[in-house]
C-alpha cells in the first residue's frame, strides 16, 4: 500500500476547526501478524528529506498521537490529553485517518506529517509518510470556512 494526502494545502481562518487527512491506498496486509500504527507531527518545509524532523503538535509529541490497529479497522480516540489540547484523532474502515485541530490560530500553521508504520512478524517494518501544509489566516471572520486544495492545481474544496 501507499499513503496519499487528498489535499496538500489547507487554508483556514483563525478560530475554525481544521481536519487534516491522510489515506492508505491499496491493500493493507491481512493476517494475525500485522499491526498498523499511525501518527502525526509537525515538520519543516525546507528539508532535503520531507518529514524527517519531528516537532510536537500543540505540545503533544507523535508518541502521544499514535493510533494503533490491525489493517483497516476503525479507531477513534478522544483521549483526555488530546482533548485538552483541542486535538482529535480518527481513522475509518476505508484507510482514511485524520487529525482535527480545534479553534486554530496562526501558531498552528506549518507542515503536518502523517506516518504509517506496518509491522509484520519476521519482516522489517515498513514506513510511509504523507505531508500537507496548514496556513491559518489571522483575524479572518468566523463565518468563513477552511479551504483544502492541491497546490499544483487551482481546484479547492471547503473542508471541515
Amino acid at each position: 500500500f501507499k499513503v496519499t494526502t487528498p489535499y496538500s494545502l489547507y487554508v483556514c481562518p483563525e478560530g475554525q476547526n481544521a481536519t487534516l487527512t491522510c489515506r492508505i491506498l491499496g491493500p493493507v496486509s491481512k493476517g494475525h501478524d500485522v499491526t498498523i500504527y499511525k501518527t502525526w507531527y509537525l515538520s519543516s518545509r525546507g528539508e532535503v528529506q520531507m518529514c524527517s524532523e519531528r516537532r510536537p503538535i500543540r505540545n503533544l509529541t507523535f508518541q502521544d498521537l499514535h493510533l494503533h490497529h490491525g489493517g483497516h479497522q476503525a479507531a477513534n480516540t478522544s483521549h483526555d490529553l488530546a482533548q485538552r489540547h483541542g486535538l482529535e484523532l480518527a481513522s475509518d474502515h476505508h484507510g482514511n485517518f485524520s487529525i482535527t485541530l480545534r479553534n486554530v490560530t496562526p501558531r498552528d500553521s506549518g507542515l503536518y506529517c502523517c506516518l504509517v508504520i506496518e509491522l509484520k512478524n519476521h519482516h522489517p517494518e515498513q514506513r510511509f509518510y504523507g505531508s500537507m501544509e496548514l496556513q491559518v489566516q489571522a483575524g479572518k471572520g468566523s463565518g468563513s470556512t477552511c479551504m483544502a486544495s492541491n497546490e499544483q492545481d487551482s481546484d479547492s474544496i471547503t473542508a471541515a
Epitope: 500504527y37 508518541q63 480516540t77 478522544s78 483521549h79 483526555d80 514506513r127
Partner: antibody, heavy 117, light 107 residues
Framework: QVQLQQSGAELVRPGVSVKISCKGS????????MHWVKQSHAKSLEWIGL????????TYNHKFKGKATMTVDKSSRTAYMELARLTSEDSAIYYC??????????WGQGTSVTASS | NIAMTQTPKFLLVSAGDRVTITCKAS??????IAWYQQKPGQSPRLLIY???NRYTGVPDRFTGSGYGTDFTFTISTVQAEDLAVYFC?????????FGGGTKLEIK
C-alpha cells in the same frame, strides 16, 4: 520480532538504589514511548510512568515521584528506571511495556527486585 | 485518579463456558480501555485496545465492548489455555490505572 529484554533480578539491602534496564529490538526504538509498571501481590498492577523515547521527557504517577527516575539512551535503544532508597514496599516485579496508541502492546519479561537485609 | 473497579475477582468455569468480566471507571474514559491476559509466570499480553479492537493474533473468542464508564470483556467459549488473570486498564488520563484483576480458573 519485537522484543523488550529486561535486566536480571536484583536482591539489595534496604536504603540503596537500583537501576534496571529494558532494551528494545525488532522495531524503531524512538517511534514508541515506554511505560514502566510495578506488580506486587498487594497492589496488582500499578503504573509508574511513561518516557518519550524520542524527546526523553518523562511523565510520572505522582505516587512514584522521588522514588522512580526514568531515562533513555537512544544510541543503545535502552530505557532505564532507577528506584531510590529501596524499602520492603518496593519489592515487586517491574515491567517495561511499549506504548502504542492507548495500550501497552509488548511487555518485557519483568525484573524482580527484592529489598531485604 | 480514575479508579477502575473490576468484577468478579475470581471465576471458576468449565471449558466451553461463556465468561464475562466487567470494568467500571470512576469517571468517563471514552473508549480508552485495554484488556490484558497474564498467564502464570508470564508477562501481561495485550488482547483488546480501544475498548473493542482485538489485537493482532488474538483469537476471536475474545471480545470487548463499552464506552464511557462501563466496559465488558467476554470469552465466548473458554478453553483450557485461557487460565490466567485478566486486567482492564484506562489510558484516558494520567496516572494510567488498572483494574484489580480477575483470576480465571478452569474446573
Amino acid at each position: 520480532q519485537v522484543q523488550l529484554q529486561q535486566s536480571g533480578a536484583e536482591l539489595v539491602r534496604p536504603g540503596v538504589s537500583v537501576k534496571i534496564s529494558c532494551k528494545g529490538s525488532g522495531y524503531t526504538f524512538t517511534d514508541y514511548g515506554m511505560h514502566w509498571v510495578k506488580q506486587s501481590h498487594a497492589k496488582s498492577l500499578e503504573w509508574i510512568g511513561l518516557i518519550d523515547t524520542y524527546y526523553g521527557d518523562a511523565t510520572y504517577n505522582h505516587k512514584f515521584k522521588g522514588k522512580a527516575t526514568m531515562t533513555v539512551d537512544k544510541s543503545s535503544r535502552t530505557a532505564y528506571m532507577e528506584l531510590a532508597r529501596l524499602t520492603s514496599e518496593d519489592s515487586a516485579i517491574y515491567y517495561c511495556a511499549r506504548r502504542a496508541g492507548n495500550a501497552m502492546d509488548y511487555w518485557g519479561q519483568g525484573t524482580s527486585v527484592t529489598a531485604s537485609s | 485518579n480514575i479508579a477502575m473497579t473490576q468484577t468478579p475477582k475470581f471465576l471458576l468455569v468449565s471449558a466451553g463456558d461463556r465468561v464475562t468480566i466487567t470494568c467500571k471507571a470512576s469517571q468517563s474514559v471514552s473508549n480508552d480501555i485495554a484488556w490484558y491476559q497474564q498467564k502464570p509466570g508470564q508477562s501481561p499480553r495485550l488482547l483488546i485496545y480501544y475498548a473493542s479492537n482485538r489485537y493482532t493474533g488474538v483469537p476471536d473468542r475474545f471480545t470487548g465492548s463499552g464506552y464511557g464508564t462501563d466496559f465488558t470483556f467476554t470469552i465466548s467459549t473458554v478453553q483450557a489455555e485461557d487460565l490466567a488473570v485478566y486486567f482492564c486498564q484506562q489510558d484516558y488520563s494520567s496516572p494510567r490505572t488498572f483494574g484489580g484483576g480477575t483470576k480465571l480458573e478452569i474446573k
